[in-house]
Amino acid sequence: KLLQVSTIAMQQQEKLIQQERALLNFTEWKRSCALQMKYCQAFMQNSLSSAHNSSPCPNNWIQNRESCYYVSEIWSIWHTSQENCLKEGSTLLQIESKEEMDFITGSLRKIKGSYDYWVGLSQDGHSGRWLWQDGSSPSPGLLPAERSQSANQVCGYVKSNSLLSSNCSTWKYFICEKYALRSSV
């Protein structure tokens, strides 16, 4: 009889341990769900506020036609400048026309004055051809004035109303570009 009671007690204890384990798993699952819910809510909130503001460009970016531009407040070498732009979902400035060049240089005059700003232009070491980062060639009127006698890689930058070239490892400000959001209204 005593052995029977002891067996039942052990079975009950085993059951209790299993239930505690299940409860622990459930609590962990609940916590994980709550955490995911938090992420979801934050994401939704973000999306909703973006949609509500529906500004074509983010804060501190300048709009011109279909593009948004960010003029950096820090110096960096060309490659780091590119990474900084990518972190914000943009690329270094790619100037498509004289009109765009005029807008950029005009805006820079108002904002900062005569400084150097990296753009997304670099010179192929083998062919010597100037190419934008997407692989396209600049239009003839938008080729950098030859100024760099560097043996290192050469990249393009804007200063005043000119497109110039310099060793990519020098420190300059930079300009990022992304597409402006179209208004859905």
Epitope: L86, K87, E88, T91, Y179
Partner: nanobody
Framework: QVQLQESGGGLVQAGESLRLSCVVS????????MGWYRQAPGKQRELVAA???????SYVDSVKGRFTISRDNAANTVYLQMNSLKPEDTAVYYC?????????WGQGTQVTVSS
Amino acid sequence: QVQLQESGGGLVQAGESLRLSCVVSGRTFSINAMGWYRQAPGKQRELVAAITNQGRLSYVDSVKGRFTISRDNAANTVYLQMNSLKPEDTAVYYCAAFQSSGIDWGQGTQVTVSS
């Protein structure tokens, strides 16, 4: 945190092609752009190609016209199509996710091009 898993590396002859894939998981909504870096022995890691969420592209000079970056948002995958491979393309290729807070890298996949 974003998790990145590369595949598709291997040993090829000069002039041949390879396609690298990178599957992205985790907090993918925080990603603003995706890219591929490479690092050859004794050299610095360099950004080979990148694509923003808007589809803006960027390539290093040495691969322009040979490599193409693309992404499949539905499959959370980024690709690097590498054509006309050269021995100097030999390196470990790393997938990268660009976020405002920084850059996350995968573990890398080895690409070896023999002459």
